[in-house]
């Protein structure tokens, strides 16, 4: 005997109860795939969840955060807080970055500043809580009578401001 | 059915109090840290308060330390917010909502949060 049910498209399903009939899905339910025998509740995004694609016959609701929180894992199935530039999420609250750490982004942890002499560099600029260390030259390339790929500036006579 | 359900909230005068409950259902309380989080007339989502497991353990935001307390019943599988002192600047929607699995270790993320119950402060 064949399978009926295999002919039932996306939206419906297999109503075993009315001799394999194809069923539209009932309201806040949908099926994705064609030969289902029952259809899947939809995903109801409410409180900290906010509706970004309405549930159809054949797809799933899809959610999204509310402003002042940002999206975690698979199809945003949590919502998780943003902190501000400089500070790092902990489970008291948004918490500045450490001396020495810095976060550029609203999420993630504080990262340590670039340790510009491991590379045989030094700090061009200084890290803030918001912004990594810039490194610059190694402190050789800097140093009096180091070769330099730029030509010394002319030399000025002794009591004249640079203009 | 997961499913979580705020009461409580209503029309106070600064100065005054409130205690909102959050009654939780289709789930274990006692298994999940539990937060209370809000949202002002136009503003996003701000978070309020969180408690652990047990109630060992509770974190509040600078802006109610002091005025508010988040406590929990786990054998009535419920959770509550006494806020005291209100002001014009507490009022919002309060959302109870449930730390994700591996909440405290691996992120801060919330899975599930009821409607809200809307808290009004005025004269």
């Known amino acids: 005997l064949q399978d009926l049910c295999s002919n039932c498209p996306a939206g419906t399903f297999c109503d075993n109860n009315r001799s394999q009939i194809c069923s539209p899905c009932p309201p806040n339910s949908f099926s994705s795939a064609g030969g289902q025998r029952t259809c899947d509740i939809c995903r109801q995004c409410k409180g900290v969840f906010k509706t970004r694609k309405e549930c159809s016959s054949t797809s799933n609701a899809e959610c999204d955060c509310i402003s002042g929180y940002h999206c975690l894992g698979a199809e945003c199935s949590m919502c998780e807080q943003d902190c501000k530039q400089g500070q790092e999420l902990t489970k008291k609250g948004c918490k500045d970055c450490c001396f020495g750490t810095f976060n550029d982004q609203k999420r993630g942890i504080c990262r340590p500043w670039t340790n510009c002499s491991l590379d045989g560099k030094s700090v061009l600029v200084n890290g803030t809580k918001e912004r990594d260390v810039v490194c610059g030259p190694s402190p050789a390339d800097l140093s009096p009578g180091a070769s330099s790929a730029t030509p010394p500036a002319p030399a000025r006579e002794p009591g004249h401001s640079p203009q | 059915q997961v499913q979580l359900v705020e009461s409580g909230g209503g029309l106070v005068q600064p100065g005054g109090s409130l205690r909102l409950s959050c009654a939780a259902t289709?789930?274990?309380?006692?298994n999940y840290w539990m937060n209370w989080v809000r949202q002002a007339p136009g503003k996003g989502l701000e978070w309020v308060a969180n408690i652990n497991q047990d109630g060992s353990e509770r974190y509040y935001v600078d802006s109610v330390k002091g005025r508010f307390t988040i406590s929990r019943d786990n054998a009535k599988n419920s959770l509550y917010l006494q806020m005291s002192s209100l002001r014009a600047e507490d009022t919002a929607v309060y959302f109870c909502?449930?730390?994700?699995?591996?909440?405290?270790?691996?992120?801060?993320?919330?899975?599930?949060s009821g409607q809200g119950t809307t808290v009004t402060v005025s004269s």
């Open positions: 289709g789930f274990t309380l006692s």
């Open positions: 909502a449930r730390g994700g699995e591996g909440y405290g270790v691996d992120h801060y993320g919330l899975d599930v």
